[in-house]
């Protein structure tokens, strides 16, 4: 058992153009109040019961009268928390709907009139006993800022409020295997009653009636040692009980996804992709139809033709997920190159580039060939965030602006003489050698090592190197 607590911080116009008109006026003063509805993400009830985890209504806020000509400010809020008590375990995953209502206080016949100003919804994961979680949700032009938490009511403790605490029997310490109950240090965790027959050495439980096995043990009561054949495919740490490597559990081992859901390992845990008609962390919530309003954030629900397609949510721009419950972060497309920082501004994606890079996606290396000319017919070659010029014959230097002496590197072999030429260099070969760089010896019988000298060219003639 425990309490879900919701603290509304502000309700007012969201950022961007199109500020909403104030809901109240001098002629029609009004005040706000809020309603919260919770559904468990891990309960069969969620589809049938609108608020299976519970609902709560806030007190009325202070009366507000619009100042003429002024834009709608953040509106005055009711005092205090909205509290939704839950009787059983906290489900860990839950759906919420928070509605902002306006109560008009004019001269209505028959009392005040109520109208819904805004509704936001979402699905979240939350451990009981954790800190306040902050959230911002938009509904049209309005923005709601709030915090929420789930806390257990004594004697319950733990992330699901399923462990129990009892006053200490001994003043100094708790019994064997039992921890003090933080924050109630003067109390101890009450022993859980595991499934009957669950091995006290190799099994444990986190909820009454279950039997979970320590590594190296298996079976419904954790009495069967894991087969040594598992040493063939080691995955995890060594087990002292079997003396060999026992596969550590992968998050998808045994497929935690129900109802035909498929399990994908993620860096942190696992994710179930559910068949249509099922949702929840493990696809255990079923029987949902469009009548249950499963699409959040203005998603359009379309009924499917067969049981596998009970419904599908067509999400408005900016939302995704089976139930349009996730805000699309287009930065998850990884659009920015070269270490650029991605910003999803809603109307557009922006990449903030690191020094030395530019372009909408930081794809241009400012040290690269873009806008960088190599002189005298040289070509620019990119590489490693820098650029260099591959110069035409006869030119050198960083930008090929310096006239090079083609003979400086002594390119003519076997004592050939080098002559600079407008199109390159010419080698005049010593007797007995031929080739563009005098690299081929002429055979004593006068035949060359090459198939034939080009017509009109005798071995020993100067040869131009192009």
């Amino acid at each position: 058992a425990g309490v879900f607590e919701l603290q509304i911080h502000s309700f007012g116009p969201g950022p961007g153009p199109g500020a909403p008109r104030s809901p109240c006026s001098a002629r029609l003063p009004c005040r706000l109040f809020f309603r919260v509805c919770l559904k468990p993400g891990l309960s069969e009830e969620a589809a049938e019961s609108p608020c299976a985890l519970g609902a709560a209504l806030s007190a009325r806020g202070p009366v507000y009268t619009e100042q003429p000509g002024a834009p709608a400010p953040d509106l005055p809020l009711p005092d205090g928390l909205l509290q939704v008590p839950f009787r059983d375990a906290w489900p860990g995953t839950f759906s919420f709907i928070i509605e902002t209502w306006r109560e008009e206080l004019g001269d209505q016949i028959g009392g005040p009139a109520w109208s819904l100003l805004a509704r936001v919804a979402g699905r979240r994961r939350l451990a009981a006993g954790g800190p306040w979680a902050r959230d911002i949700q938009r509904a049209g032009a309005w923005e709601l800022r709030f915090s929420y938490r789930a806390r257990c009511e004594p004697p319950a403790v733990g992330t699901a409020c399923t462990r129990l605490c009892r006053p200490r029997s001994a003043p100094s310490r708790c019994g064997p295997g039992l921890r003090p109950c933080a924050p109630l240090e003067d109390e101890c965790e009450a022993p859980l009653v595991c499934r009957a027959g669950c091995s006290p050495e190799h099994g444990f439980c986190e909820q009454p009636g279950e039997c979970r096995c320590l590594e190296g043990w298996t079976g419904p009561l954790c009495t069967v040692p894991v087969s040594t054949s598992s040493c063939l495919s080691p995955r995890g740490p060594s087990s002292a009980t079997t003396g060999c490597l026992v596969p550590g559990p992968g998050p998808c081992d045994g497929n935690p996804c129900a109802n035909g859901g498929s399990c994908s390992e993620t860096p942190r845990s696992f994710e179930c992709t559910c068949p249509r008609g099922f949702y929840g962390l493990r696809c255990e919530v079923s029987g949902v139809t469009c009548a249950d309003g499963p699409c959040f954030n203005g998603g359009l629900c379309v009924g499917g033709a067969d049981p596998d397609s009970a419904y599908i949510c067509h999400c408005p721009p900016g939302f995704q997920g089976s139930n349009c419950e996730k805000r699309v972060d287009r930065c998850s497309l990884q659009p920015c190159r070269n270490g650029g920082l991605c910003l999803d501004l809603g109307h557009a994606l922006r990449c903030r580039c690191r020094a030395g890079f530019a372009g909408p996606r930081c794809e241009h290396d400012l040290d690269d060939c873009a806008g960088r000319a190599c002189a005298n017919g040289g070509t620019c070659v990119e590489g490693g965030g820098a650029h260099r010029c591959s110069c035409a014959l006869g030119f050198g230097g960083r930008d090929c602006r310096e006239r090079a002496d083609p003979c400086a590197a002594r390119p003519c072999a076997h004592g050939g003489r080098c002559y600079a030429h407008f199109s390159g260099l010419v080698c005049a070969c010593a007797p007995g050698y031929m080739g563009a760089r005098c690299e081929f010896p002429v055979h004593p019988d006068g035949a060359s090592a090459l198939p034939a000298a080009p017509p009109g060219l005798r071995p020993g003639d100067p040869q131009r190197y192009l």
Partner: antibody, heavy 117, light 107 residues
């Protein structure tokens, strides 16, 4: 050079599951999101969604919510597409493609999946 | 969703011809318009991205232009190896969408 190599053709029965792989090489796998595209026989290309290769978070187009799952094996520079409870209309060629910020610059050769009883 | 329409589903041209393939979007999408080529063997390659940028290794006879909702791909001097189906795709708004394709054949 940059390459995306996909697993071979698959012949499956309705109701079965198929898992297609796309192995990337020639670049840092986690720097670029991986996208999946479907092409039914004689039809055009249809974008299915993507997976962020850094976080493993997938995003699905509306028509591919439910029975389709994108996943990764980062250590092997491999992306996967799994289709559960196969139907005849899943018969198609499936492509993986690397997104470079503007477009899908590099594509796998495609994997043909045939669903027939 | 943004609808992409390639009104010409097939096109016949002669070698050496200048060929233009058009694509219309149902709404403006900030020049995030790409062109892909699918060869008869099924392989898909990017040709043009961001309306007019030539992908590396693509011959310069391919070019792209357009803005707002109307875009086009031009092949300035048709070669035999250009026989393929060409698809436009918008990459601005999710979900990304493709045109129906234009199949290019030799007369």
């Amino acid at each position: 050079q940059i390459q995306l190599v996909q697993s071979g053709p698959e012949l499956k029965k309705p109701g079965e599951t198929v898992k297609i792989s796309c192995k990337a090489s020639g670049y840092t796998f986690t720097d670029y999101s991986m996208h999946w595209v479907k092409q039914a026989p004689g039809k055009g290309l249809k974008w299915m969604g993507w997976i962020n290769t850094e976080t493993g978070e997938p995003g699905y187009a509306d028509d591919f919510k439910g029975r389709f799952a994108f996943s990764l094996e980062t250590s092997a520079s491999t992306a996967y597409l799994q289709i559960n409870n196969l139907k005849n209309e899943d018969t198609a060629t499936y492509f993986c493609a690397r997104y470079d910020g503007y477009a899908m610059h590099y594509w796998g050769q495609g994997t043909s999946v045939t669903v027939s009883s | 969703d943004i609808q992409m329409t390639q009104t010409t589903s097939s096109l016949s041209a002669s070698l050496g011809d200048r060929v233009t393939i058009s694509c219309r979007a149902s709404q403006d999408h900030s020049n995030y318009l790409n062109w892909y080529q699918q060869k008869p063997d099924g392989t898909v390659k990017l040709l043009i991205y961001y309306t007019s940028r030539l992908h590396s290794g693509v011959p310069s006879r391919f070019s792209g232009s357009g803005s707002g909702t109307d875009y086009s791909l031009t092949i300035s001097n048709l070669e035999l190896e250009d026989i393929a189906t060409y698809f436009c795709q918008q990459g601005d708004m999710l979900p990304w969408t493709f045109g129906g394709g234009t199949k290019l054949e030799i007369k």
